[in-house]
């Protein structure tokens, strides 16, 4: 019977203290005087002195009010000793359970909760969750059981019950349809948390619900009609800025405009882009407009948003009348680049071609011509007719001015408009080869031994084009054939020169006549240095000295 049942003590007891809880009693007190003591946290170890025992009576005493939220249970040991200090009982477990009082109000975890929900959502859509805590017991009592409620809603539009809160989870949901960001962008809910499952102490907090934008408003042109004037031929020219208004959230995809030319741009002359800041539609020319072809364009532009509409909405259309303004246009050579074949070396004053320009303007303007760039100064141009004639010798083989047989000339046409305008054309003369160059050997200086001489191979070049080149023919003239032989190889592009008789060391002229396939002949003198030596030599050796 040295046992005590768990002792329940309410927290926050009013006393008076010390308060008697229970009496420890050993039945050994019939035989001897017993002294009682207790040990454990709350008695002789921290928190010390919460409990004590009257050593003579065994009364377990509480010295102060308890706080369940600090310590909910104490485990002590009771001891019984005789007057001489000898233990008369085993230590006894004493459990003291602190029972809860509703001494704490609920506390929201935040003063202000923030959540958001898309406008136009259906009732039942979850918005956010709020949380309140209560330090009191929620397992054995309702002291710490929190019930949530909405105390008030501001503004009360379209009515005062737009939201509901789940009483036990704190989840805030939409309860009514009609959330419209453009009318009410934000609601402030005063929320309550009440302990005792709704029958106790109450605390409040604020839940701010932001209504997020949905694309439920179409952009509208304002104004819907525009007139613009554009000079012809201008590319990338800003024609008009189109202005729209959109009630959706600025700078969001539901507000940013997308423009589309729906009609009136058959020639694909226009393009429209969105200004990133003002949201205006910037209509510009993609191609030059032609006043002479069409002096007015009526465009139809539709506007939508980057984001799709969340419901079926009528789209706004703008009408833009574009007046094309006439400008004095430059004459245009036809074609802009003209290729003409002409024989090189034609006589001076001989016509090469006629190269003329057309004026896009409808008035009959007079066009005058002149040569703008003629690097070799070979040509002249009639200012009235555009007749191009030779004034110098056209030389296909002139490497300074002719590239790949083509001589390039730039010509200019000027109208008599006010102010006058000019256009340029490129004349590409393809020079047809004439057999005006004979073959030439390379090199033209040779060194050769007068004993067992090595054959000298000379390359043959001809500035003309085939068929005025190889096969070549060689012939020695002016008695050069007495000492020398000249033979063209099978390919007909090299000549082999051989010394056939002994010559003393000296320098000699070898007269070599080469002719091309068109029998154009060229006489070349080869300077031959003959050395006293055998076989191959590059320079003559000096005189030999005996020792």
């Amino acid at each position: 019977d040295w046992v005590v049942a768990p002792i329940s003590v309410p927290e926050n007891g009013k006393g008076p203290f010390p308060q008697r809880l229970n009496q420890l009693k050993s039945n050994k007190d019939r035989d001897t005087k017993i002294f009682y003591s207790i040990t454990g946290p709350g008695a002789d170890s921290p928190p010390e002195g919460v409990f004590a025992v009257e050593k003579e009576t065994g009364w377990l005493l509480l010295n102060k009010p308890l706080d369940r939220e600090e310590i909910a249970k104490y485990e002590l040991f009771g001891h019984a000793v005789s007057e001489n200090g000898a233990s008369v009982e085993d230590p006894m477990n004493i459990s003291i359970i602190v029972t809860d009082q509703n001494d704490h109000k609920p506390k929201f975890t935040q003063d202000t909760f923030r959540g958001s929900v898309l406008e136009g959502v259906l009732p039942g859509t979850s918005v956010m969750q709020v949380t309140a805590t209560d330090e009191d017991d929620a397992i054995y009592t309702y002291n710490g059981v929190v019930a949530y409620s909405i105390h008030s809603q501001e503004p009360k539009d379209p009515h005062d019950l737009m939201f509901t809160i789940h009483r036990s989870t704190g989840t805030i949901s939409v309860i009514s349809s009609g959330l419209d960001r453009e009318k009410v962008p934000e609601y402030t809910l005063t929320i309550q948390a009440t302990d005792m499952d709704g029958d106790g102490s109450t605390t409040t907090a604020v839940a701010v619900v932001e209504i997020l934008d949905a694309n439920d408003n179409a952009p509208m042109f304002d104004p819907q009609k525009y007139e613009a004037h554009v000079p012809e031929n201008a590319v990338g020219h800003e024609v008009q800025r189109l202005t729209v208004t959109d009630l959706d959230a600025p700078n969001s995809p539901a507000w940013r405009a997308t423009y589309l030319i729906m009609g009136g741009d058959d020639g694909d002359h226009f393009t429209i882009t969105t200004h990133p800041e003002s949201n205006q539609g910037i209509l510009t020319t993609r191609k030059g407009l032609d006043f002479e072809a069409k002096n007015q364009h009526t465009l139809y532009v539709e506007v939508t948003n980057e984001a799709p509409f969340v419901l079926k909405l009528p789209t706004s259309t703008a009408t833009i009348v574009v007046h094309v303004e006439d400008v004095n246009e430059a004459p245009v050579f036809v074609p802009p680049s003209k290729v003409v074949e002409v024989q090189e070396g034609i006589p001076t004053g001989e016509p090469v071609c006629v190269y003329t320009a057309e004026d896009p303007d409808k008035e009959n303007q007079k066009i005058s011509y002149r040569i703008l760039r003629d690097p070799a100064g070979w040509l002249a141009m009639d200012p009235d007719s555009g007749q191009v004639t030779a004034v110098g010798t056209l030389d296909r083989e002139d490497e300074q001015f002719v590239r790949n047989n083509i001589y390039e000339v730039m010509v200019l046409a000027m109208d008599n408009g006010s102010p006058p305008t000019t256009g340029t054309g490129t004349l590409l003369l393809t020079l047809i080869d004439v057999n005006d160059h004979g073959p030439v050997p390379e090199p033209r200086q040779i060194t050769i031994c007068n004993q067992s001489p090595v054959r000298q191979v000379l390359n043959i070049t001809d500035k003309d084009l085939s068929p005025h080149t190889s096969p070549f023919q060689a012939q020695l003239t002016d008695d050069s054939d007495i000492y020398w032989t000249a033979e063209v190889n099978e390919e007909g592009d090299t000549v082999v020169l051989s010394l056939k008789k002994f010559l003393k060391q000296d320098t000699y002229d070898v007269h070599l006549s080469l002719s091309d396939h068109g029998n154009k002949e060229q006489l070349t003198v080869i300077r031959a240095t003959v050395c006293d030596c055998h076989g191959h030599v590059e320079t003559c050796p000096g005189p030999w000295k005996g020792g």
């Epitope: 008076p16 010390p18 002195g49 010295n63």
Partner: antibody, heavy 116, light 107 residues
């Protein structure tokens, strides 16, 4: 062994305050309560109040409420009784006594004389 | 407050006499009564707690009894050192209150 040693005798003028100390030894100071009892010359015993020596919670007799302050200094195991607005009828021997409800050990007493 | 009425207020007795002092509470105090002995110029000494239990070291000639409202301290054989004033006290509820005292004198 348990000992309660009180401060020496005091002579005070009416309206003044007196603070009597009671230094304890020989027991676990913080588990107990200290009571204060006074005895006017030739009179009986009168309970003033008590204080829990660990937590400092107090109980006072209605008669002394507002005039008496009981305090404790755990570091020196000393309890104090301060009585303010002294009058001649507060002349008495003031005792500290250890106990929970009944008192098992008493201090030797401190004579406080209130005289103008 | 609970009043503790002690009687007699004084008595004369001889060594060896049996002495009885009574204390009456103005309301039920169960057994929450203690008895103290005080000699002139000295602090009180604790004799009895819980109406009938002697403190360690208190001679067995001292005994207490009673519960509720009526309590008695008995000295079975008065000894010379027992001449003193005796006080009862209730600690059942605050404020704790004392009897006015019984002075035991030599006859």
């Amino acid at each position: 062994q348990v000992q309660l040693v009180q401060s020496g005798a005091e002579v005070k003028k009416p309206g003044a305050s007196v603070k009597v100390s009671c230094k304890a030894s020989g027991f676990t100071f913080t588990s107990y309560w200290m009571h204060w009892v006074r005895q006017a010359p030739g009179q009986g015993l009168e309970w003033i109040g008590n204080i829990q020596l660990s937590y400092g919670n107090t109980n006072y007799a209605q008669k002394f409420q507002g005039r008496v302050t009981l305090t404790v200094d755990k570091s020196s195991s000393t309890a104090y009784m301060e009585l303010s607005s002294l009058r001649s009828e507060d002349t008495a021997v003031y005792y500290c006594a250890r106990g929970f409800s009944y008192f098992d050990y008493w201090g030797q007493g401190t004579l406080v004389t209130v005289s103008s | 407050d609970i009043q503790m009425t002690q009687s007699p207020s004084s008595l004369s007795a001889s060594v060896g006499d049996r002495v009885t002092i009574t204390c009456k509470a103005s309301q039920n105090v169960d057994t929450d009564v203690s008895w103290y002995q005080q000699k002139p110029g000295k602090a009180p000494k604790s004799l009895i707690y819980w109406a009938s239990n002697r403190f360690t070291g208190v001679p067995s000639r001292f005994s207490g009894s009673g519960s509720g409202t009526d309590f008695t301290l008995t000295i079975s054989s008065l000894q010379p050192e027992d001449f003193a004033t005796y006080f009862c006290e209730q600690y059942s509820s605050y404020p704790f209150t004392f009897g006015q005292g019984t002075k035991v004198e030599i006859k």
